[in-house]
């Protein structure tokens, strides 16, 4: 196999008895993406697969970047918070049991939620064989794979390969269509010697040789262009050091009252379980760990406040206190922990060192192609397409990997709008009531009528503002029974949600400005009722007078209209959103400084922003009754987050509104919190922390969609599968490995 040139078969070349291509899912644990480029000459077989088939620059693991969570994510398409295997070690208060890789408890089906690939295949009449895979020797939903092997790490790799080849030799009626194969390397060697070590180099040669044996065996059976093979890893690997340790004893006078899952992705819970599990004061722990040292190498979070892109909160097994640890550092209880040096993983899945490999080859895959990175939650849908079966519900976005396939099996379409919009029409030039709003600059009713008339756009003006400010179409509302209306302005368009009494979204385009100076200040102390919105559906300005620590923010920044006259279009109740005062500082800095910078760098950006309500922190928009549970003496709900989606043209010679090809996206989902303690901003100017904070909360457009019930880019003329690629793209700014 190795000596031959790449075959370019136009259709599957399967021998007699193989009606449809088998699928082999092959995992090499801890194979970080960088190994593939650094040590390619030492891995001729894997390198040939990379050259001849399709590969991604890397595949993103899910957080925490550990073995069991990611292997099970790959075969379910579910986030760890959804499938339940949230770490290699965990406690479930409902089961009152501990899960670990060294205990038989791991084979209790109660831990394993979701539907793994082998069951999906079997439920649809196909046989499945697993040569090791986390979960494969567990009776999930009462069933095992058709063929499985009890885990035994001492079985030589060659023996594993020859067994799989024997399965391929089975008579057609007994032969599986789906296979898994698992190697512990290069992970074991990476832990022992670190990622840059002779041990890893040796391990890479060993796994490459075994992989070559598989490909040669397929060739001998004339299956090398029949089988669809996916070679991937669960996560990467990074170096750790014994002088890069954070000890909890440096932060607490005593530590015996809590239990800590130590390492690169630490969690803290009560020591006395189950008794103290729910009463444990997680907030106090996070307070005691926040902003304690100038060079602190972890950030403490309550899990609901973690970046939403991690989807690591909604499971009782995820302890409420979480430490987000710097690259190559470890957080542990005390100096008695000497488990350092060598390699480790589990860190932030944006770190380049945590990136995993993905390569694929076979009749269904494109050839000699490199694709952009994607997340491992997408692999399950891809495998279902290869097997031509229906996936179980999962967190992947079906169709987002269609560009890997010669002929896609599943054709996605845009979601149908669920709640139709109306237009909040202009009828009364003078408000029927003030809503307790004041604008001293507007001295009399003539002036008030004059500025209100500016909200009364002609059809031509509406067409013009839509073209510029909604270049990819208005966001469609996928939530049920959401009474909302469109509000058109010359400089922005918004979708006003009557139930929330605030805009659900606001869309505007910031051009590339010759003048990159910060925006001028907003006209002060000037607010008025929007005459287009019924007062009974509006916020009252008096809502913000009470001592609530809450002030009004503007979704569309009024100062974007650089003249005070045009600012009046934005100084209206329909543009108000409730914001904590500390949050607003950051919000205002982003809009007055950073947004101008982005627009300058990208030849203009379209901005869509709005509130998010995710009180139950499940990553999906809350039902109305969930939101109302959290109202305190108000009928204006306080958002849990705000989103901002920046869209520009990939080809920077075009503006967003005239973009013929691919778009570039930069979405943010910023937790709406009463303080900025996450950034330790004391005594620091905004320039030193706001951008870093926004960057920490970058997300996918898809994450924004799930949290808002909105659907973006429906009017962008581009195949839907390409739009889904855009929506599942996560911008990253990590440069060092």
């Amino acid at each position: 196999w190795l000596e031959e040139n790449c075959d370019t078969a136009q259709q599957s070349q399967c021998p007699e008895g193989f009606d449809l291509p088998p699928v082999i899912l092959f995992s090499m644990d801890g194979f970080r993406a960088e190994y593939l480029y650094t040590w390619d000459t030492l891995m001729p077989n894997i390198n040939k697969l990379k050259t001849c088939g399709i590969h991604s620059k890397y595949m993103r693991a899910m957080y925490p970047t550990k073995t069991f969570p990611n292997h099970y994510t790959i075969v379910t398409g579910l986030y760890p918070e959804s499938h339940g295997i949230i770490d290699n070690n965990m406690y479930d208060v409902n089961l009152n049991k501990n899960f670990s890789l060294s205990s038989k408890e791991q084979n209790n089906p109660a831990w394993w939620h979701g539907q793994p690939m082998w069951l999906t295949a079997m439920y649809q009449g196909l046989k499945a064989a697993t040569y090791f895979w986390p979960g494969s020797e567990v009776a999930i939903n009462g069933s095992f794979p058709s063929i499985y092997m009890p885990y035994n790490g001492s079985v030589p790799f060659e023996e594993r390969i020859s067994t799989l080849l024997k399965w391929l030799d089975l008579p057609k009626a007994e032969r599986p269509r789906f296979y898994t194969m698992y190697f512990e390397e290069p992970d074991s060697s990476g832990h022992a010697g670190g990622p840059v070590s002779a041990r890893v180099i040796k391990a890479l040669q060993v796994v490459d040789h075994a992989f070559g044996m598989l490909m040669e065996g397929l060739k001998q059976r004339n299956l090398h262009n029949c089988v669809n093979i996916i070679l991937l890893a669960d996560h990467g690997m990074d170096q750790t050091y014994c002088n890069k340790m954070e000890y909890m004893t440096d932060y607490f006078p005593r530590i015996n009252f809590f239990y800590m899952y130590e390492g690169p992705a630490p969690r803290i819970r009560a020591h006395n379980i189950p008794h103290d599990f729910f009463s444990f004061n997680s907030e106090e722990i996070v307070r005691n760990l926040s902003c304690r040292k100038p060079d602190q190498h972890f950030k403490p979070y309550l899990t609901p406040d973690l970046p939403k892109r991690l989807h690591y909160a909604k499971n009782v097994r995820i302890d409420k206190v979480h430490l987000f640890v710097d690259q190559q550092w470890l957080a542990v209880r005390s100096k008695s922990n000497t488990n350092c040096g060598g390699g480790n993983h589990g860190y932030n899945n944006e770190f380049r060192s945590m990136e995993a490999i993905f390569l694929a080859h076979g009749p269904s895959f494109k050839e000699k192609t490199e694709v952009e990175p994607f997340e491992n939650i997408e692999v399950y849908n891809l495998m279902c397409d290869l097997l031509r079966i229906q996936p179980a519900p999962n967190n992947g976005t079906h169709g987002s990997l269609n560009h890997l396939l010669k002929v896609p099996f599943y054709e996605p379409s845009h979601a149908e709008e669920v709640s139709k919009f109306s237009v909040c029409g202009f009828a009364n030039p003078l408000p029927t009531e003030s809503l307790d709003c004041f604008c001293p600059h507007l001295q009399n009713s003539t002036q008030l009528e004059q500025v209100n008339q500016m909200l009364n756009l002609t059809q031509e003006e509406i067409t013009a503002t839509v073209k510029v400010n909604l270049p990819f179409g208005r966001p469609r509302v996928l939530q049920k029974n959401v009474d909302h209306c469109l509000l058109y302005h010359r400089e922005y368009v918004s979708g006003f949600g009557k139930a929330m009494r605030m805009p659900m979204w606001s869309s505007y385009t910031v051009p590339q400005l010759g003048d990159t100076s910060p925006l001028p200040p907003t006209v002060p102390d000037c607010l008025r009722a929007d005459v287009r919105v019924p007062p009974s559906e509006s916020q009252k300005c008096s809502f913000y007078l009470a001592d609530k620590n809450i002030t009004h923010g503007f979704l569309y920044p009024p100062a974007s209209n650089r003249t005070s006259d045009s600012q009046y279009d934005a100084l209206i109740t329909s543009n108000l959103v409730p914001m904590y005062e500390e949050f607003r500082k950051m919000w205002d800095y982003f809009h007055s400084v950073l947004l101008i910078k982005h627009a300058t760098e990208r030849n203009g950006v379209n901005v869509v922003s709005g509130p998010i309500f995710d009180y139950n922190y499940d990553g999906h928009f809350d039902a109305p009754d969930e939101i109302t549970k959290h109202l305190a003496n108000t009928d204006v709900p306080i958002p849990t987050h705000y989103f901002v989606v920046l869209t520009s043209c990939k080809n920077k010679s075009h503006t967003p509104e005239n973009c013929p090809g691919w778009l570039d996206v930069l979405p943010f989902i910023i937790p709406h919190r009463p303080t900025n303690v996450e950034s330790c901003p004391e005594g620091k100017p905004e320039a030193l922390w706001v951008e870093e904070r926004f960057t920490a909360h970058i997300a996918r457009v898809r994450d924004v969609e799930l949290l808002t019930g909105l659907d973006f880019y429906q009017d962008k003329v581009q195949p839907v599968s390409e739009i889904l690629q855009l929506k599942t793209y996560l911008p990253t700014f990590e440069t060092t490995i």
Partner: antibody, heavy 120, light 107 residues
Framework: QVQLQESGPGLVKPSETLSLTCTVS????????WSWIRQPPGKGLEWIGY???????NYNPSLKSRVTISVDTSKNQFSLKLSSVTAADTAVYYC??????????????WGQGTTVTVSS | DIQMTQSPSSLSASVGDRVTITCRTS??????LNWYQQKPGKAPKLLIY???SLQSGVPSRFSGSRSGTDFTLTISSLQPEDFATYYC?????????FGPGTKVDIK
């Protein structure tokens, strides 16, 4: 189904405070606006105000200085207090539930009303 | 404030008649108008919400419509149980005002 029942004294002296309670049974007080409406003898309906289950209120400006509407979710009750009453406050007082979504605050469930007379 | 006028203030009709009651508002209030029926000694009952939507359980002979600031309640074929006073109510402003009422009695 949801039922509302007003309770409170039928006779109040001038300058005193009128206090009524509305008990909600057969359903939750959550997610609705709870209103008080009155009807003087032989006259039309006058809206007094509402309280949202979360506690936020909205009052008829003509009564705002004298009226307080509050909610007690634990008891599934809301109440009306009208201070400094005069004979002009004599009326049948109704409590009602207003539904906002798509009902545009339509008052779909009413109590049977209680007559309050202001007299010394 | 939004002023509400109802016409006629009273009308006499026979069973089977088509009856139309009009409510006019001083401002454009979109569809923020509800109609209620009240019988002597009883609490009002919601008939129509959002100008034209029939409240569940209300007979289909009742209908509502809007033309600008004029709102109409129509009873297509008057029944004996329909003799009552009818009120419109606006919920556009934060002060929910009722119209003065229209009394429908037997001719």
């Amino acid at each position: 189904q949801v039922q509302l029942q007003e309770s409170g004294p039928g006779l109040v002296k001038p300058s005193e405070t009128l206090s009524l309670t509305c008990t909600v049974s057969g359903g939750s007080i959550s997610s609705y606006y709870w209103s008080w409406i009155r009807q003087p003898p032989g006259k039309g309906l006058e809206w007094i105000g509402y309280v949202y289950f979360s506690g936020s209120t909205n009052y008829n400006p003509s009564l705002k200085s004298r009226v307080t509407i509050s909610v007690d979710t634990s008891k599934n009750q809301f109440s009306l207090k009208l201070s400094s009453v005069t004979a002009a406050d004599t009326a049948v007082y109704y409590c009602a539930r207003a539904t906002r979504d798509y009902y545009y605050y339509g008052m779909d469930v009413w109590g049977q009303g209680t007559t309050v007379t202001v007299s010394s | 404030d939004i002023q509400m006028t109802q016409s006629p203030s009273s009308l006499s009709a026979s069973v089977g008649d088509r009856v139309t009651i009009t409510c006019r508002t001083s401002h454009d209030i979109s569809n923020y108008l509800n109609w209620y029926q009240q019988k002597p000694g009883k609490a009002p009952k919601l008939l129509i919400y959002a100008a034209s939507s029939l409240q569940s359980g209300v007979p289909s002979r009742f209908s509502g419509s809007r033309s600008g600031t004029d709102f109409t309640l129509t009873i297509s074929s008057l029944q004996p149980e329909d003799f009552a006073t009818y009120y419109c109510q606006q919920t556009y402003s934060t002060l929910f005002t009722f119209g003065p009422g229209t009394k429908v009695d037997i001719k």
